[in-house]
């Protein structure tokens, strides 16, 4: 379906609200160092200039490709070397290399400021002052601290940002109607981005092969009154709409998803009785709604897979015939009757599956060597359950702090060449597990909290690979994208491990501890944690307890002291001193 | 293979309650459906309410809002909550597992009788 004009083209389909906020995104996810001025104003001149190209689809430069049309609108930011350093080399290259080099430079973590929230008033007259502003700022900041961020997604957080806004200015109390919702849009967004950058790494780094079996296990779990044809549409379809998303073209990534959503909902009937409700809704609702929509029914009596996948004497024929589409249809057949497991557990047992076929295949009597395939599958079942199990009754007995306290004491001894704050960033996070899933039914546990550790070691796995110092953890994000979680949970005390030198300024408090948020004490409490480990990685659970809990009573008395600086001048060290005769 | 017992059938008055289990052995981890069927005298087995794998659950018109399924898994233990019990209710009970991996599997039956 080709255009003499693919900017026009996308013009066209989008509108221009949608067309100017995707560029936008875009440019930001691009250069995440540049003013918000700036990207407008490159907005501005691609969206005049896209609009010439409606009026005229032969004029000049209209046929250009987007990567080179956006491209050269970005090399021609005057800063571009000082700000962003060898990224310019990229301007030198041509498309598609050009746009694969900007790709390349995408920051994970970018060294911006965190985004203060100002006075709900203040935040209220700048949304009165200037609507189209406010918003285009929430897409900019947000879309250049994620620079993977699922942008047609992003429109949809911008949407109901502005909602919250339309709709908590006007109220008697703004901030108790506004804040709960932005505190809402904040940690679902996090999440969206989250989930987002796995999408993309497995895409980037394991290939699209990997992400159709993903997209196959969860949309089988998803739909299982679907026939495997309708499901390997969707999951062609979604693989084209997500590699565009992850690949910086996000013009054709929102008009494909779009295009998938109109599809889903016309043909409602052959997929799930769940997407009424979606289908009724806007646009950018309806997508959302589609991608969160529950798993429908499993159809009732589905027979056993033996017959098909391991009595039937055909097993190697069928294999050998199209092993792609023959362990799809397995996949796909395992996931339907299984929404109890995790998407990767899934993924696991297809692949020890096709193993098994790939050795018996080759054997004398096929058959009888994979008669018994099944009896390989319980052992993988069993251990993320009892994973699961476990963790979610230390969860229950420590509750979510402690627990994110065990976690990083954990993964200290595992990586503790990893640094600090990716330390404590990532095990807050795997701790979130508990309060998210264990409070779920049994059925929901596993793919809840499977699937969610997945999410939150792929962030692991890519701020590691920006600043690598550990082998380890290089060999379990590399080696293979399903076992990545069981990787990390059989690593054991790194005994190779020089531990760190003791740094009496690392343990030096102050008393702007005290007017810290809940949340900011317990990052430093935990980033004194880490660093305890790390210069005693054999410490016991019992000493490190002991040096946490004296450590709280102490900060507890120096805030509740008169003059406080004083109080913890005079405490800090007698607390370094007792802690470090603690874990002698 | 997946062995099924049932347990916890009797005599029961009309308007009383009983609560069915059924302990699973064997192959367990490849269980994905889990239901209970009842056979009255001279008719023949009909489904009475269905849980599946993802926790979903299904009722015969007959015993919705009288009964609730429930699944342990940590116990293998599937139970059937029978309240309101109705004469019409008599039967044996039957236990049925649908596996992953292997054959259905039925239980050796519970008699259940409602009668003052």
């Known amino acids: 379906d080709t255009h003499k004009s693919e900017v026009a083209h996308r013009f066209k389909d989008l509108g221009e609200e949608h067309f100017k906020g995707l560029v936008l995104v875009a440019f930001s996810q691009y250069l995440q160092q540049c003013p918000f001025e700036e990207h407008v104003k490159l907005v501005n001149e691609v969206t005049e200039f896209a609009k010439t190209c409606v009026a005229d689809e032969s004029a000049e430069n209209c046929d250009k490709s987007l990567h080179t049309l956006f491209g050269d609108k970005l090399c021609t930011v005057a800063t571009l070397r000082e700000t962003y350093g060898e990224m310019a080399d990229c301007c030198a290259k041509q498309e598609p290399e050009r746009n694969e080099c900007f790709l390349q430079h995408k920051d994970d973590n970018p060294n911006l400021p965190p985004l203060v929230r100002p006075e709900v008033d203040v935040m209220c007259t700048a949304f009165h002052d200037n609507e189209a502003t406010f918003l285009k700022k929430y897409l900019y900041e947000v879309a250049r601290r994620h620079p993977y961020f699922y942008a047609p997604e992003l429109l949809f957080f911008a949407a109901r940002y502005k909602a919250a806004f339309a709709e908590c200015c006007q109220a008697a109390d703004k901030a108790a109607c506004l804040l709960p919702k932005l505190d809402e849009l904040r940690d679902e967004g996090k999440a969206s981005s989250a989930k987002q950058r796995l999408k993309c790494a497995s895409l980037q780094k394991f290939g699209d092969r990997a992400f159709k079996a993903w997209a196959v296990a969860r949309l089988s779990q998803k739909f299982p009154k679907a026939e495997f044809a309708e499901v390997s549409k969707l999951v062609t379809d979604l693989t084209k709409v997500h590699t565009e998303c992850c690949h910086g073209d996000l013009l054709e990534c929102a008009d494909d998803r779009a295009d998938l959503a109109k599809y889903m909902c016309e043909n409602q009937d052959s997929i799930s009785s769940k997407l009424k409700e979606c289908c009724d809704k806007p646009l950018l609702e309806k997508s959302h709604c589609l991608a969160e929509v529950e798993n429908d029914e499993m159809p009732a009596d589905l027979p056993s897979l033996a017959a098909d996948y391991v009595e039937s004497k055909d097993v190697c024929k069928n294999y050998a015939e199209a092993k792609d589409v023959f362990l799809g249809m397995f996949l796909y057949e395992y996931a339907r009757r299984h929404p109890d497991y995790s998407v990767m557990l899934l993924l696991r047992l297809a692949k020890a599956y096709e193993a098994t076929l790939e050795k018996c295949c080759a054997a004398a009597d096929p058959h009888e060597c994979y008669a018994k395939v099944f009896d390989e599958f319980q052992p993988l079942v069993e251990e993320p359950q009892n994973l699961v199990k476990q963790n979610c009754e230390l969860f229950e007995q420590l509750g979510e702090y402690k627990f994110q306290n065990a976690l990083l004491v954990r993964y200290t001894k595992k990586v503790p060449q990893v640094s600090t704050p990716t330390l404590v960033e990532v095990s807050r996070n795997l701790g979130k597990v508990g309060a998210k899933c264990c409070k779920l039914p049994e059925a929901k546990r596993m793919p809840c909290a499977e699937d969610y550790l997945s999410v939150v070691l792929n962030r692991l796995c890519v701020l590691h690979e920006k600043t690598p110092v550990s082998e380890k953890v290089t060999k379990c994000c590399t080696e293979s994208l399903v076992n990545r979680r069981p990787c990390f949970s059989a690593l054991e005390l790194d005994e190779a491990y020089v531990p760190k030198a003791f740094n009496a300024e690392t343990f030096t408090f102050h008393a702007d501890m005290c007017t810290l948020s809940e949340k900011e004490k317990q990052v430093k409490k935990q980033t004194a944690l880490v660093e305890l480990v790390k210069h005693k990685p054999k410490a016991t659970k019992e000493q490190l307890k002991g040096v946490m809990d004296n450590f709280a009573a102490f900060v507890e008395k120096c805030c509740k002291a008169d003059d406080k600086e004083a109080c913890f001048a005079e405490e800090g060290p007698k607390f370094v001193a007792a802690s470090q005769a603690a874990l002698a | 293979e997946v062995q099924l017992v049932e347990s916890g059938g009797g005599l029961v008055q009309p308007g009383g309650s009983l609560r069915l289990s059924c302990a699973a052995s064997?192959?367990?981890?490849?269980?994905?459906?889990l239901a209970w069927y009842r056979q009255a005298p001279g008719k023949q087995r009909d489904l009475v309410a269905r849980?599946?794998?993802?926790?979903?659950?299904y009722y015969a018109d007959s015993v919705k809002g009288r009964f609730t399924i429930s699944r342990d898994n940590s116990k293998n233990t599937l139970y059937l909550q029978m309240n309101s019990l109705r004469a019409e209710d008599t039967a044996v009970y039957y236990c049925?597992?649908?596996?992953?991996?292997?054959?259905?599997?039925w239980g050796q039956g519970t008699l259940v009788t409602v009668s003052s």
């Open positions: 049925y597992a649908q596996s992953t991996w292997y054959p259905p599997s």
């Open positions: 064997g192959s367990t981890w490849s269980i994905n459906t």
């Open positions: 849980i599946s794998s993802g926790g979903s659950t």
